[in-house]
Amino acid sequence: MNGRVDYLVTEEEINLTRGPSGLGFNIVGGTDQQYVSNDSGIYVSRIKENGAAALDGRLQEGDKILSVNGQDLKNLLHQDAVDLFRNAGYAVSLRVQHRLQVQNGPIGHRGEGDPSG
C-alpha cells in the first residue's frame, strides 16, 4: 500500500544582501498569474547559480514569499511584485513559507497526533 504524502509548512525570515547581479532568483504568481489554484501568492521558481540567494542557501525553489521588507505580498499583480523586489534596496528581508513534503506510513496505520478523518 502506498504511503500518504503530507506537507510540513514552516516560516522563516531570510535576510539577503543584494549581490553584484542582484538577488538571484525568479518568481511566479500574482493575482493575474496564479501559479497555485486559488492562490495568488508569489512563489520562487528559480534560484540562480552563484547568486545572492543561492550563496545564502536558505531560499528554495517552491518557497512562497509572504513579505518583502515587511510589505505583504498578498493580492499583488505579478509585475507589481517584481517591481517591489527590484526596488527593495541593498538589504532585503524576506518572510518565506517552506513546504516540505513528508512521506507518512502506509494508509491505515495512523501515527500518534495524525489527524483522523
Epitope: N26, I27, V28, G29, S45, R46, E49, E61, G62, F85
Partner: nanobody, 128 residues
Framework: QVQLVESGGGLVQAGGSLRLSCAAS????????MGWFRQRPGKERDVVAT????????YYLDSVKGRFTISRDNAKNTVFLQMNSLKPEDTAVYYC??????????????????????WGQGTQVTVS
C-alpha cells in the same frame, strides 16, 4: 534538481518526421521553462526551440521555423519536439533542458535567454 529523459530519436530519411519527447521529474513541471538544443558533429551546442512555463511564448532557430514545433503537456510532465521535413543537416544529438520560469526579481535586462540549469543525456537523430 530536475531529471530529464529524452526519447524518440533515431534514423530517418530526408523529408521524414520524428517526434522527440522529454519527461521531467524532480520538481513541479508547470513552473519550468523548457528547451531543446542540439549538438551537430564538430559544432557547439545550439538552441533549437524553447517554450516558457505558461506555454504562451516559444522561440525557434531560424533554420527550423515552419518545420519544427515545440509543445508541452503539463499533465504528463513532458515537452515535445515535432520535427518534420527533416534534412541531413538536422543530424545531431538533441538535448532537453529545463530551468525555473517566471520573472527575474533583478533587472529586466537580466535575460540569460538560453541559459538553462538542468540537462538530459541527449538522443541521437540521424537524417540520411
Amino acid at each position: 534538481q530536475v531529471q530529464l529523459v529524452e526519447s524518440g530519436g533515431g534514423l530517418v530519411q530526408a523529408g521524414g518526421s520524428l517526434r522527440l519527447s522529454c519527461a521531467a521529474s524532480g520538481r513541479p513541471f508547470s513552473s519550468l521553462d523548457m528547451g531543446w538544443f542540439r549538438q551537430r558533429p564538430g559544432k557547439e551546442r545550439d538552441v533549437v526551440a524553447t517554450i516558457n512555463w505558461t506555454g504562451d511564448s516559444t522561440y525557434y532557430l531560424d533554420s527550423v521555423k515552419g518545420r519544427f514545433t515545440i509543445s508541452r503537456d503539463n499533465a504528463k510532465n513532458t515537452v515535445f519536439l515535432q520535427m518534420n521535413s527533416l534534412k541531413p543537416e538536422d543530424t545531431a544529438v538533441y538535448y532537453c533542458a529545463a530551468r525555473g520560469g517566471g520573472s527575474s526579481v533583478d533587472s529586466e535586462y537580466d535575460v540569460g535567454e538560453f541559459e538553462y540549469d538542468d540537462w538530459g543525456q541527449g538522443t541521437q537523430v540521424t537524417v540520411s
